[in-house]
């Protein structure tokens, strides 16, 4: 349960991540598991350890082996092993099993591949991809961020696909590969214009001062699995967590799928202990996808408590 | 939003043992320590000890050592304390609270009080 | 183990301006890893305790960024730059640095 199968490429930066996790860590310490013997936190070395991190730059055959990583706290060490292997580089373009990462299915909706492993690195954009060894053009292929988008994917596009970026290490650069498979799968789905079902545009939303309040953004955004879709509330035209309010925060509800099929994504505002500028502000239930962006805004107003008394007396 | 549900307010004999239990929901509780802290008047707040509720192991303050015993259940997402040989001294609010990726006690339960009586 | 030690009660503070409260450690806090293991708590009447600093400065989630905090290695103060009402309860300073963890006695807030 607490040991990892890790591998490489010889003359490649490796980089792993103790199995074990802190609940929190104070520190962690690695060992080659075979010595016993404690692998050096300074960087000068070409193996060396780094918090949860083990570096191998670059890693060499040699370097095979377990290694044991202790996650210290004042409560509890907690023990991990990371299983490396590193293999020699192919001299031909296919990339063996024992290479590949896990398989990742898309369809003509939604075609990401990420880069296995890298947010354990420190890269730069762009990523190179390829596939079968072929350097992928033409304007189908777009590289974002840490994965691969490929446009009106098509069954022929199954295959193998390996990205390949640069780690940087103290001004030194390290290449890394990863491979892993793509298969298409046939979806009917498909993607429209965001549809807001609720706020409804220019709603008054009545409430209580000093109470708490909710605001539900709800939108639909097509059949089947979607590619980007997203539903955001906005405060005067900024973002939420840049507004700076702590009583007001919005939290995702459930990604919704109708038995009509229908996608829907819900976010909802919540307002804590509701203040009189707070009715001041203009509430913009966003809601965007591929097709573009809907707005929906809501105003507050006051709700008067009934009076007791005027009903009694 | 993280919550710990603890048991309601015990009344108990002196000798006597008894299990405080707190709820955990709206995170998995394997991935957390679970602390548990006591609260009087007099001594104000105690460290009693810490359960890894993935593996069982615990770790307790010596004054608690024999006193108290942590365990936790991972299917019912639910970790107890059993507190035994109970004495007028052991009268207390007691909180269960859990750590977080970066440090301890990080949300806290609402509290049992404890009262041992003849 | 390691003490903790707080003023009982700190002066009274009037609405709207800033308040202090020490906290100090007989051991240092600062652990080998660079990171200094003291927290503040407030426990409001009536409710359980709350985090609002860990590893001496930072700010917990969701606590408003009137609270600060700094130290050394064993002495430690909490500032509150605009008290409000709901400010007032009960403030613990705690050392997460070694078992068994250990707490201040608690600092009362109190408003004019």
């Known amino acids: 349960k607490f040991s990892k199968q890790s591998w490489g490429l010889e003359n490649e930066a490796l980089i792993v991540r103790c199995p074990r996790q802190g609940k929190p860590s104070y520190t962690v310490d690695w060992y080659y598991s075979q010595t016993n013997k404690s692998i050096p936190t300074q960087e000068r070395n070409r193996v060396f350890a780094s918090g949860q991190l083990l570096k191998f730059l670059p890693a060499a055959v040699a370097d095979s082996g377990i290694y044991t990583c202790i996650v210290r706290s004042p409560t509890f060490n907690r023990t991990g092993y990371a299983n490396v292997t590193i293999y020699k580089k192919q001299s031909d373009c296919n990339v063996p099993d024992y290479l590949m990462y896990s398989t990742v299915s898309g369809s003509e909706k939604n075609s990401k591949i990420y880069c296995p492993t890298i947010d354990l690195y420190n890269w730069t954009a762009p990523l190179e991809w390829f596939k079968n060894c072929q350097a992928l053009q033409g304007s189908r292929y777009r590289a974002h961020k840490s994965f691969l988008v490929i446009d009106n994917v098509m069954t022929e596009d199954a295959g193998d696909y390996t990205c390949k970026f640069i780690h940087n290490e103290n001004g030194a650069n390290y290449s890394v590969t990863a491979t892993r498979s793509f298969t298409v799968k046939d979806e009917q789905g498909f993607s429209l214009f965001p549809v807001i079902g609720a706020p409804a545009q220019n709603e008054i939303k009545e409430v209580e001062i000093g109470k708490n309040a909710n605001l539900t953004c709800s939108a639909c955004f097509g059949k089947g699995t979607q590619f980007l879709a997203a539903v955001l509330w906005q405060l005067n035209g900024t973002k939420i967590t840049d507004f700076g309010e702590p009583r007001i925060q919005q939290e995702e509800g459930q990604n919704q799928s109708f038995s009509n099929g229908l996608a829907c994504l819900d976010m909802v505002l919540r307002i804590a202990d509701v203040k009189e500028e707070d009715l001041l502000l203009q509430y913009d239930c966003l809601a965007l996808n591929l097709h573009g962006l809907r707005r929906h805004t809501v105003r507050l107003s006051r709700k008067n408590p009934i009076d007791h008394h005027s009903i009694y007396c | 939003q993280v919550q710990l549900q603890q048991s309601g307010a015990e009344v108990v004999r002196p000798g006597a043992s008894v299990t405080l239990s707190c709820k955990a929901s709206?995170?998995?509780?394997?991935?957390?320590?679970m602390h548990w802290v006591k609260q009087t008047p007099v001594h104000g707040l105690e460290w009693i000890g810490a359960?890894?509720?993935?593996?069982?192991?615990?770790a307790y303050s010596q004054n608690f050592k024999g006193k108290a015993t942590l365990t936790a259940d991972e299917s019912s997402s639910t970790a107890y304390m059993e507190l035994s040989s109970l004495t007028s001294e052991d009268s207390a609010v007691y909180y269960c609270?859990?750590?977080?990726?970066?440090?301890?006690?990080?949300?806290w339960g609402q509290g049992t009080t404890l009262t041992v009586s003849s | 183990d390691i003490v903790m030690t707080q003023a009982a009660i700190s002066n009274p503070v009037t609405l709207g301006t800033s308040a202090s409260m020490s906290c100090r450690s007989s051991?240092?806090?600062?652990?080998?890893?660079?990171?200094?293991?003291l927290y503040w708590y407030l426990q409001k009447p009536g409710h359980s305790p709350q985090l609002l600093i860990y590893q001496m400065s930072n700010l917990a989630s969701g606590v408003p960024d009137r609270f600060s905090s700094s130290g050394s290695g064993t002495d430690f103060t909490l500032k509150i730059s605009r008290v409000e009402a709901e400010d007032v309860g009960v403030y613990y300073c705690a050392q997460n640095l070694e078992l068994p963890f250990t707490f201040g006695s608690g600092t009362k807030l109190e408003i004019k």
């Open positions: 709206d995170y998995t509780i394997t991935d957390y320590e």
């Open positions: 609270s859990r750590s977080a990726t970066d440090y301890y006690f990080a949300s």
């Open positions: 051991k240092s806090l600062l652990h080998s890893n660079g990171i200094t293991y």
């Open positions: 359960i890894d509720p993935e593996t069982g192991d615990t």
